[in-house]
């Protein structure tokens, strides 16, 4: 009997989709209503629980007990501003349970509360059942997708939802990455191409730039907004028609949840119509207080209502291009993903931005993510089909990862948007003479100073044999695996003694909003940060040079090679500089550099005289460019250039 297939699930904010790779191709599986996408809705009634189309179809009758948008809650704390903001727009109740949000509904006559993971697991169960009905056998293995900027807690919660649904989650992958796989399968053997994936779905917006080359996918940059999508366009229509109803009938329907819900359903239908027609009609019988609401809207008016939202989609496009260090002319292909990319105005804005470049619409935008997830599931299950066997997926680290060095400086070992899995090693040293240990403090973020970044974890490497500052060699390795799990190891090269920390999904990491905020702030403060980074770098260069010179002339091996007068000259100047440094830690870069040059002017001629013809370091051989590093609690570590 053939091995059971693994499925790919696009667990969307508003709609979900499931696919399977078999017989060398992907099948997107239709549900029992014949729909290839299924609403991410769960409804609770007096008699039953409904999932998918059945749940969404009765939403107007049962708004308080019909749950959607679980993806906006999953992995978040109740106090999260996003949760607090979203709650205002939901007809169902969200309660606080130990700072975890829970959805409270009435089910079979009882009040029940469910975690977002449970709601999502119900949708996943539905998707699993859709696949099983099609395949004819039980399915357990699955790849599930999440937005690119989901943080670890959101990813872990999604994985938990899969487990609750009885799935073995092979991997959580980014939606744009999955879409890239779907696109790339059709594109192997065409040489390296830069592809921009524009994914505008029901609830999230992701822009990704990938390089696709002979089946190898590399994510170069991701940007987006987890709070922009088709629902926002629906809201604009709803608001427009609420105002129209007020004008026509002098009545405000906005506080009547059932009326708003029915209006929203009609608006969503009208929006879809406007993608293929220039006008759409709405006919809602007895919308409010017995009043029938018959109206229409033109595509032009819809575009005007949403113009700022549509235009705002270009900002992440520009940002992704900046991050990928690409000009728009260097993008070979533009790929549309997500149902909202069917909107003609969205397509036109994107096409105009890229100077009339054709948009690739070959992939059904609603199905691309599930398609790619299905391919990835097949790869992880060891499918040997020639369509997938050469496919390699390279994901990225959304934020730079590094450690704190002398002066509180963020020294990044893995840069933001680096392809993962990845491993980076760097040599560091001690900051003080006879320092017995170093404190390795691991951070993520884009700011110059660690205080402005997010601490992921810390550990100490102790037992360093007594030695002058700068002598011990501590090898630090950052290793991220394909699942985004980070291992940081520090090894004292002289003793082989090592210590490590593993930073996994269960450590509270940053939310998408925090990541976005940090990236935006990092851009906003880039100039400021650069000044600060340069200032600390100049300070450390001076400090390092002063200590190096001091220890150089005090070296017993130099006895008789350096005159007492020269030795005194160097030591006096080093003493002057070291004391000045102690009193002027907040001096400007120019001041540190001036002092370093002054010290070099005294020391270089004397030191170089000692090494001429000896094959040792020549002028400035001790390195004016010192560590780039910082203070913090515990022993400090310095970067070695």
């Amino acid at each position: 009997m053939a091995k059971a297939a693994a499925i790919g699930i696009d667990l969307g904010t508003t709609y979900s989709c499931v696919g399977v790779f078999q017989h060398g191709k992907v099948e997107i599986i239709a549900n029992d209503q014949g729909n290839r996408t299924t609403p991410s809705y769960v409804a609770f009634t007096d008699t039953e629980r409904l999932i998918g189309d059945a749940a969404k179809n009765q939403v107007a009758l049962n708004p308080q007990n019909t749950v959607f948008d679980a993806k906006r809650l999953i992995g978040r704390k109740f106090g999260d501003p996003v949760v607090q903001s979203d709650m205002k727009h939901w007809p169902f109740q969200v309660i606080n349970d130990g700072d975890k949000p829970k959805v409270q509904v009435s089910y079979k006559g009882e009040t029940k509360a469910f975690y977002p993971e449970e709601i999502s697991s119900m949708v996943l169960t539905k998707m699993k059942e859709i696949a099983e009905a099609y395949l004819g056998y039980p399915v357990t293995n699955a790849v599930i997708t999440v937005p690119a900027y989901f943080n670890d807690s959101q990813r872990q919660a999604t994985k938990d939802a899969g487990v609750i649904a009885g799935l073995n989650v092979l991997r959580i992958i980014n939606e744009p990455t999955a879409a890239a796989i779907a696109y790339g399968l059709d594109r192997t053997g065409k040489g390296e191409r830069n592809v921009l994936i524009f994914d505008l779905g029901g609830g999230t917006f992701d822009v990704s730039i990938l390089t696709i080359d002979d089946g190898i996918f590399e994510v170069k940059a991701t940007a987006g907004d987890t709070h922009l999508g088709g629902e926002d366009f629906d809201n604009r229509l709803v608001n427009h028609f609420v105002e129209e109803f007020k004008r026509k009938h002098k009545k405000d329907i906005s506080q009547n949840k059932r009326a708003v819900r029915r209006l929203r359903t009609a608006c969503e239908r009208a929006k879809r119509t406007l993608s293929s027609s220039t006008q759409a009609s709405l006919e809602i019988d007895s919308l409010f207080e017995g009043i029938d609401f018959y109206t229409s809207i033109t595509r032009a008016r819809f575009e005007e209502l949403c113009s700022d939202l549509f235009r705002s989609t270009l900002e992440p496009v520009e940002k992704a291009l900046r991050d990928a260090k690409l000009d728009k002319a260097q993008i070979h292909d533009l790929v549309l993903v997500g149902g909202s990319t069917r909107i003609p105005k969205v397509q036109k804005l994107l096409q105009d931005f890229f100077n009339g470049r054709d948009l690739n619409k070959s992939i059904n935008p609603d199905e691309a993510v599930a398609y790619g997830a299905a391919v990835q599931a097949a790869i992880l299950m060891g499918d040997k089909s020639e369509n997938v066997q050469d496919l390699l997926l390279l994901d990225v680290a959304p934020l730079s990862l590094g450690l704190e060095t002398a002066g509180g400086v963020m020294t990044a070992l893995i840069k933001r948007n680096s392809t993962i899995p990845t491993k980076q090693t760097q040599i560091f040293t001690t900051y003080s003479d006879n320092q017995p240990g170093v404190l390795i403090q691991v951070y993520e973020g884009e700011r110059a100073m660690t205080k402005d970044n997010n601490l992921l974890g810390r550990f100490e490497l102790s037992g360093i044999p007594p030695a002058p500052r700068g002598v011990p060699q501590i090898e630090v390795t950052f290793d991220i695996d394909a699942n985004g799990i980070l291992n940081v190891t520090a090894t004292d090269k002289s003793t082989g003694k090592a210590n490590k920390i593993t930073i996994t999904n269960d450590k509270g990491r940053l939310s998408k909003e925090e990541i976005e905020r940090m990236v935006q702030e990092a851009e906003k403060y880039k100039a400021e940060d650069e000044v600060q980074r340069e200032r600390v770098s100049a300070k450390n260069a001076l400090e390092s040079y002063a200590f190096n010179m001091k220890s150089a002339v005090e070296d017993e091996g130099l006895k008789g090679k350096i005159s007492e007068a020269d030795k005194k000259k160097v030591l006096d100047k080093c003493q002057e500089v070291i004391s000045w440094l102690d009193a002027n830690t907040l001096a400007e870069k120019d001041e540190f550099e001036h002092k370093r040059k002054e010290l070099e002017q005294v020391c270089n001629p004397i030191i170089s005289g000692l090494y001429q013809g000896a094959g040792g370091p020549g002028p400035g051989g001790f390195g004016a460019q010192g560590p780039k590093g910082g203070s913090g609690s515990g022993p400090t570590i310095e970067e070695v250039d």
Partner: antibody, heavy 116, light 112 residues
Framework: QIQLVQSGAEVKKPGASVKVSCKAS????????MNWVRQAPGQGLEWMGW????????TYADDFKGRFTFTTDTSTSTAYMEVRSLRSDDTAVYFC?????????WGQGTLVTVSS | EIVLTQSPDSLAVSLGERATINCKSS????????????LAWYQQKAGQSPKLIIY???TRESGVPDRFSGSGSGTDFTLTIDSLQAEDVAVYYC????????FGGGTKVEIK
């Protein structure tokens, strides 16, 4: 004996450039920094910056960043100070001065006149 | 940037009398490690280049007569010419080298 000999007076038009030289003798040129000081007519001394004669790295005071360039030629033990895009307020005597623990030896000064 | 303020702007003293010039710094020039104040005094006679007379607040440059003395610490410094001679007529400048370099505005010393 230690001497710093500067190039002669210059008259330049606004927008032009001027390069003043300062030839050192009587000591090892690369062992001491060379400073540049400006003195406008009837005004006080203004420190312009200095150059590390060993590494060739210059340092400029804030008011002298941009149009001013310090260089050295160690083979001739000469320091240079160039001003580009001359303006009338650059009219001044420019001094070079060797630095040990202070500016212990000074050149005789070079008068640069900027006039249209 | 450290600002040095000299006072008075000009000073007329009889031959053989004492001349006192003050220099106030906007921040301390004392290096606690070396216990030195990084302040120097220069003399500039009319039409000549400046000449170093005192460095590190009170150390006389070689060849400078002992009637010149410097004192002070932190932010307040004084140059004293004990018995003014005709050849001492000049403009005197203080200069800090604690961080970068800055000159004071100068004090003109004349014979009364």
């Amino acid at each position: 004996q230690i001497q710093l000999v500067q190039s002669g007076a210059e008259v330049k038009k606004p927008g032009a450039s001027v390069k003043v030289s300062c030839k050192a003798s009587g000591y090892t040129f690369t062992n001491y920094g060379m400073n540049w000081v400006r003195q406008a007519p009837g005004q006080g001394l203004e420190w312009m910056g200095w150059i590390n004669t060993y590494t060739g790295e210059p340092t400029y005071a804030d008011d002298f960043k941009g149009r001013f360039t310090f260089t050295t030629d160690t083979s001739t033990s000469t320091a240079y100070m160039e001003v580009r895009s001359l303006r009338s307020d650059d009219t001044a005597v420019y001094f070079c001065a060797r630095y040990d623990h202070a500016m212990d030896y000074w050149g005789q000064g070079t008068l640069v006149t900027v006039s249209s | 940037e450290i600002v040095l303020t000299q006072s008075p702007d000009s000073l007329a003293v009889s031959l053989g009398e004492r001349a006192t010039i003050n220099c106030k710094s906007s921040q301390s020039l004392l290096n606690s490690g070396t216990r030195k104040n990084y302040l120097a005094w220069y003399q500039q006679k009319a039409g000549q280049s400046p000449k170093l007379i005192i460095y590190w607040t009170s150390t006389r440059e070689s060849g400078v007569p002992d009637r010149f003395s410097g004192s002070g610490s932190g932010t307040d410094f004084t140059l004293t010419i004990d018995s003014l001679q005709a050849e001492d007529v000049a403009v005197y400048y203080c200069k800090q080298s604690y961080t970068l370099y800055t000159f004071g505005g100068g004090t003109k010393v004349e014979i009364k």
